[in-house]
């Protein structure tokens, strides 16, 4: 049987609290691949590091 979570695209996570429905990644998080059960926290560019690329729903920030 196919894992229902495999249908969740990048930018979402498979939400067990919502009956394995695909949910958008919450603020300050992302998922770069499909089928993820959690979204990763976005990198914070701090101190002398400046943000070269903002975190999106599918990719981490670049400092």
């Amino acid at each position: 049987l196919q894992d229902p979570c495999s249908n969740c695209p990048a930018g979402t996570f498979c939400d067990n609290n919502r009956n394995q429905i695909c949910s958008p990644c919450p603020p300050n998080s992302f998922s770069s691949a499909g089928g993820q059960r959690t979204c990763d926290i976005c990198r914070q560019c701090k101190g002398v590091f400046r943000t070269r690329k903002e975190c999106s729903s599918t990719s981490n920030a670049e400092c």
Epitope: G11, T12, N17, S23, P24, P26, P27, E54, S56
Partner: antibody
Framework: EVQLVQSGAEVKKPGASVKVSCKAS????????THWVRQAPGQGLEWMGI????????SYAQKFQGRVTMTRDTSTSTVYMELSSLRSEDTAVYYC?????????????WGQGTMVTVSS | QSALTQPASVSGSPGQSITISCTGT?????????VSWYQQHPGKAPKLMIY???KRPSGVSTRFSGSKSGNTASLTISGLQAEDEADYYC???????????FGGGTKVTVL
């Protein structure tokens, strides 16, 4: 009854900052995300950003990065949106809107809107 | 980040059906089933009519329905009524750092 009550109209000079509040009632404040959307006179809706009232994490529209700050006060169930370095193009009605349960693709309840006028 | 594309205006006679389109890309409308539609009367806050492409919140008339094909989402209003005259906006989740984006809006006129 779910309600989002926003602060009153503001008139600001270019270069100044404005802080709009949105007080929530009738639901568990920390269980629902809050979006901020603005609408310039005669124009369409523009998404500005979102805040998680539970942890305080935020995501801002690229256009407003560095100029907008969204915060919350869980003790008063209030969300704030501060926009700095105001210019005339920021003249608009600013709305807060409750994200549907937990985190979803829609906003089911909206505040009444706060008119912000930027004029010298 | 440009807005999703909607027709500026759509009109119809009472009782007719009309459809409003909302065209995006595979990075927003086409990539996710997170499309919403809002109705806005002049001077009022927007009201949610459709979410997750085709779901209707309680209290919204069954005359309103949503669908999606490829990169285009659609809102259909059947049995058009005078009170349906308003502006309608689509909204979609997107892969960009601007997490959500709106269409430019469509003015619906009941003739």
């Amino acid at each position: 009854e779910v309600q989002l009550v926003q602060s009153g109209a503001e008139v600001k000079k270019p270069g100044a900052s404005v802080k709009v509040s949105c007080k929530a009632s009738g639901y568990t404040f920390t269980s629902y995300y809050t979006h901020w959307v603005r609408q310039a006179p005669g124009q369409g809706l523009e998404w500005m950003g979102i805040i998680n009232p539970s942890g305080g994490s935020t995501s801002y529209a690229q256009k407003f990065q560095g100029r907008v700050t969204m915060t919350r006060d869980t003790s008063t169930s209030t969300v704030y949106m501060e926009l700095s370095s105001l210019r005339s193009e920021d003249t608009a009605v600013y709305y807060c809107a409750r994200g549907a349960p937990e985190y979803s693709s829609s906003s089911d309840y909206w505040g009444q809107g706060t008119m912000v006028t930027v004029s010298s | 980040q440009s807005a999703l594309t909607q027709p500026a205006s759509v009109s119809g006679s009472p009782g007719q059906s009309i459809t409003i389109s909302c065209t995006g890309t595979s990075s927003d409308v086409g990539g996710y089933n997170f499309v919403s539609w809002y109705q806005q009367h002049p001077g009022k806050a927007p009201k949610l009519m459709i979410y997750d492409v085709s779901k209707r919140p309680s209290g919204v008339s069954t005359r309103f329905s949503g669908s999606k094909s490829g990169n285009t989402a659609s809102l259909t209003i059947s049995g058009l009524q005078a009170e349906d005259e308003a502006d309608y906006y689509c909204n979609s989740y997107t892969t960009s750092s601007t997490r959500w984006m709106f269409g430019g809006g469509t003015k619906v006129t009941v003739l």
